[in-house]
Amino acid sequence: QFELEILSMQNVNGELQNGNCCGGARNPGDRKCTRDECDTYFKVCLKEYQSRVTAGGPCSFGSGSTPVIGGNTFNLKASRGNDRNRIVLPFSFAWPRSYTLLVEAWDSSNDTVQPDSIIEKASHSGMINPSRQWQTLKQNTGVAHFEYQIRVTCDDYYYGFGCNKFCRPRDDFFGHYACDQNGNKTCMEGWMGPECNRAICRQGCSPKHGSCKLPGDCRCQYGWQGLYCDKCIPHPGCVHGICNEPWQCLCETNWGGQLCDKDLNYCGTHQPCLNGGTCSNTGPDKYQCSCPEGYSGPNCEIAEHACLSDPCHNRGSCKETSLGFECECSPGWTGPTCSTNIDDCSPNNCSHGGTCQDLVNGFKCVCPPQWTGKTCQLDANECEAKPCVNAKSCKNLIASYYCDCLPGWMGQNCDININDCLGQCQNDASCRDLVNGYRCICPPGYAGDHCERDIDECASNPCLNGGHCQNEINRFQCLCPTGFSGNLCQLDIDYCEPNPCQNGAQCYNRASDYFCKCPEDYEGKNCSHLKDHCRTTPCEVIDSCTVAMASNDTPEGVRYISSNVCGPHGKCKSQSGGKFTCDCNKGFTGTYCHENINDCESNPCRNGGTCIDGVNSYKCICSDGWEGAYCETNINDCSQNPCHNGGTCRDLVNDFYCDCKNGWKGKTCHSRDSQCDEATCNNGGTCYDEGDAFKCMCPGGWEGTTCNIARNSSCLPNPCHNGGTCVVNGESFTCVCKEGWEGPICAQNTNDCSPHPCYNSGTCVDGDNWYRCECAPGFAGPDCR
């Protein structure tokens, strides 16, 4: 919707556009409007962009009005939330960005017979993007000045410069997504796909044999198992076998049988022969041992001369027995072959939490810092390590020590500075802690050890011209006598600042007032009223451009008034034989300087931009994807980082390309399995998945990789009549009309006679971007005044 809010109105004299008073009569004395004020309300008309605004024609984007919202002068800037001064124009089409706005202030007549009268009108052509921010505009010419603000906002769930991209956050079967600031779907954690309705399975889940309905899940197909569904289930009962496909039982080396449970290499698997016996496989699960000399038994486990091989370690002595041998161990060792070190730390003999380290036939205690000795039973002297930092002395205690701290220090080692700041500083002063002391840092205006004293700033008598000084905190105030002002009463009041005199009058300051010296045409206290010269002086035609009028403001007693036949854009030059020519202002040409020179002739807009002619200027409306005064800059479409999952973005014209990584696909690298989704091709294009890339088939009016660039075809041939400029707008167009023409295709001649430019019952004749007044008897001049 388009919103407009009236902010303020200044109609000092309560006048209408035609010079009359809103409330009727003028005061004969000061020529000010008397009786009641204007009953001011506003009308708004919003239409397609026009470089020269025409008042007539349809308000193709909408129109509206406010109720009466004030009198002659009012300010509504502070009245937030008051909808009386707001006009809302909803639109159901894509916002075209460029527009023309007509705002008119009207006086309500409050009766059905008398029509309402126009006070002032403003027009504005421009470009506005949807935003929550307001754009302030001012009307500063004519009888009344007013200020208003405008903005365009998209409806809920609509995004983009045209408010035509739809995205509504969703969390159900059809999608789990939020919408970013550009209206793109951003999947909730655990979901993927163009509609964010495909769960992202557990990382590593087999794409072939696993699937999921819930994010992070991995459900296996029949015959598959494991955390990632990548392991086949072997045949039930399979012992020493594996599978490549479900239900197989492929035997490991040296295993046989249907279930791979028969050991074909018993010797290798169990190594049953001891003492260097040689093993031979004799059949499934069968073997035979050949024993070396001196050993016997099925596994060569019986030693016939046991002590020969020195089986007792660590200097143990060996004794042969009927079962083999027996070892007698040396101190500190135990076990059948004396190879186990006896744990001398069991039980632990170390006192006061000491750690016991086992040695051969002995132990060692590692003591905590406060203890020493073989079993940590002796008190250590901690003062030897000089632990006290800011102390007078160190005393050794049992299992501890004591530091006698210097003043201002505390803590076990006297290393903590005592905080002496205990709220002594007054008047919000800050306290800085020192060693055994503090210092107060006073805020401006205070002094003393504790900032308890207010400094008297009046002590230096700063006030001038008899001003009275008032002492305040960190400042003083001067109370000035009449006629003086300023912070020190140093200024004589200047009633001419700001200047109250209007229409270029000189202001003179007096002791308690001011005086305006009015130029010849004006009168009144502030020189705000136009003199009625016709009451006093007759006029005389001098030449085809000038009339003379008696005046006491010039040395010759005559004042010359120029004709406005050349309109607002030229000056009249008198020629012989009652003829004249017009000297035109920059940017205008023609007999009456009524034609705006076409500044677009040199085609300054680049990259397919459309040039809109202005007055001695031009404006470029850029093709999609370009910006800058001449459409010279390619907009960086990568600025929003559209590529997901580590994809690299490359900027194109009104488009971008994502170079996807690690198997991700699609326009924004968001999909695992398809290059295409509903959002890949814009403006109704059809997407085709071509394996490593996608291709868009575009409908009429669109081209580019993703159907994102509008073809000029909607402007070919030019549908705009009478020299209008065609601006491509997707599959349609907008015409920017030349002066004097209006309507969607610039086919209607603007009514230059609106509103009534001819005074004193003169008849208006409308031309192409000009008008002529045919005056009633007794009146003359271009507007019969």
Epitope: P169, R170, D172, F173, F174, E195, K213, D217, E678
Partner: antibody, heavy 125, light 112 residues
Framework: QVQLVESGGGLVQPGGSLRLSCAAS????????MSWVRQAPGKGLEWVSA????????YYADSVKGRFTISRDNSKNTLYLQMNSLRAEDTAVYYC??????????????????WGQGTLVTVSS | QSVLTQPPSASGSPGQSLAISCTGT?????????VSWYQHHPGKAPKLIIY???KRPSGVPDRFSGSKSGNTASLTISGLQAEDEADYFC????????????FGTGTKVTVL
């Protein structure tokens, strides 16, 4: 007011085909997702298929995937369900339903807001 | 096919209150507030009477109300009237289900 009227039901042999239609009125048809829901005799309701407002996205229950096709003609305000390879277990009253949206913690979700009166499909030899 | 459990029937005299339960799991009713209730007169179109657990569409009398506790949703009809005699079924969304919404077994309400 919203109105949904189903048609096209009837008796068909196993393996045969049938096309159901649902004529919609009283709302902007192209702005809403639509669904087909069925109820077999003596059983509960079962969702069958759904289609997005533009017709660009379609969804099917596992039991009908590959046999049924949902479509819509937004210019005619009509929803369709093409049913091929019909089985005895497809016998049911078929309802078309308009999806409405509710908001919960800033996210919308769908639920069947309006239903038609249903059309009976019987698959029998 | 239906996974939400409802009592097969319920009855009450005119003017009385009547409650129907709809029990699911933490994956559906318990985990989401996406519960709706429908009234179905035989041969007519089912009609939405409650959505979002406890919200009433315009035109539905305020004697119909909805609530939820844990994995069970409830529909209460206070001040039972003769025209309330119909089948009632609940519906919910389940995150791990294959369908956008699935339904209760249905309850036949009789006004004595």
């Amino acid at each position: 007011q919203v109105q949904l009227v189903e048609s096209g039901g009837g008796l068909v042999q196993p393996g045969g085909s049938l096309r159901l239609s649902c004529a919609a009125s009283g709302f902007t048809f192209s702005s809403y997702a639509m669904s087909w829901v069925r109820q077999a005799p003596g059983k509960g309701l079962e969702w069958v298929s759904a289609i997005s407002g533009s017709g660009g996205s379609t969804y099917y229950a596992d039991s009908v995937k590959g046999r049924f096709t949902i479509s819509r003609d937004n210019s005619k305000n009509t929803l369709y369900l093409q049913m091929n390879s019909l089985r005895a277990e497809d016998t049911a009253v078929y309802y078309c339903a308009k999806e409405d949206l509710a908001m919960r913690r800033g996210y919308s979700y769908g639920y069947p807001g309006y239903w038609g009166q249903g059309t009976l499909v019987t698959v029998s030899s | 096919q239906s996974v939400l459990t409802q009592p097969p029937s319920a009855s009450g005299s005119p003017g009385q209150s009547l409650a129907i339960s709809c029990t699911g799991t933490s994956s559906d009713v318990g985990g989401y507030n996406y519960v709706s209730w429908y009234q179905h007169h035989p041969g007519k179109a089912p009609k939405l009477i409650i959505y979002d657990v406890n919200k009433r569409p315009s035109g539905v009398p305020d004697r119909f109300s909805g609530s939820k506790s844990g994995n069970t949703a409830s529909l209460t009809i206070s001040g039972l009237q003769a025209e309330d005699e119909a089948d009632y079924f609940c519906s919910s969304y389940a995150v791990n289900n294959n369908s956008p919404y699935f339904f209760g077994t249905g309850t036949k309400v009789t006004v004595l």
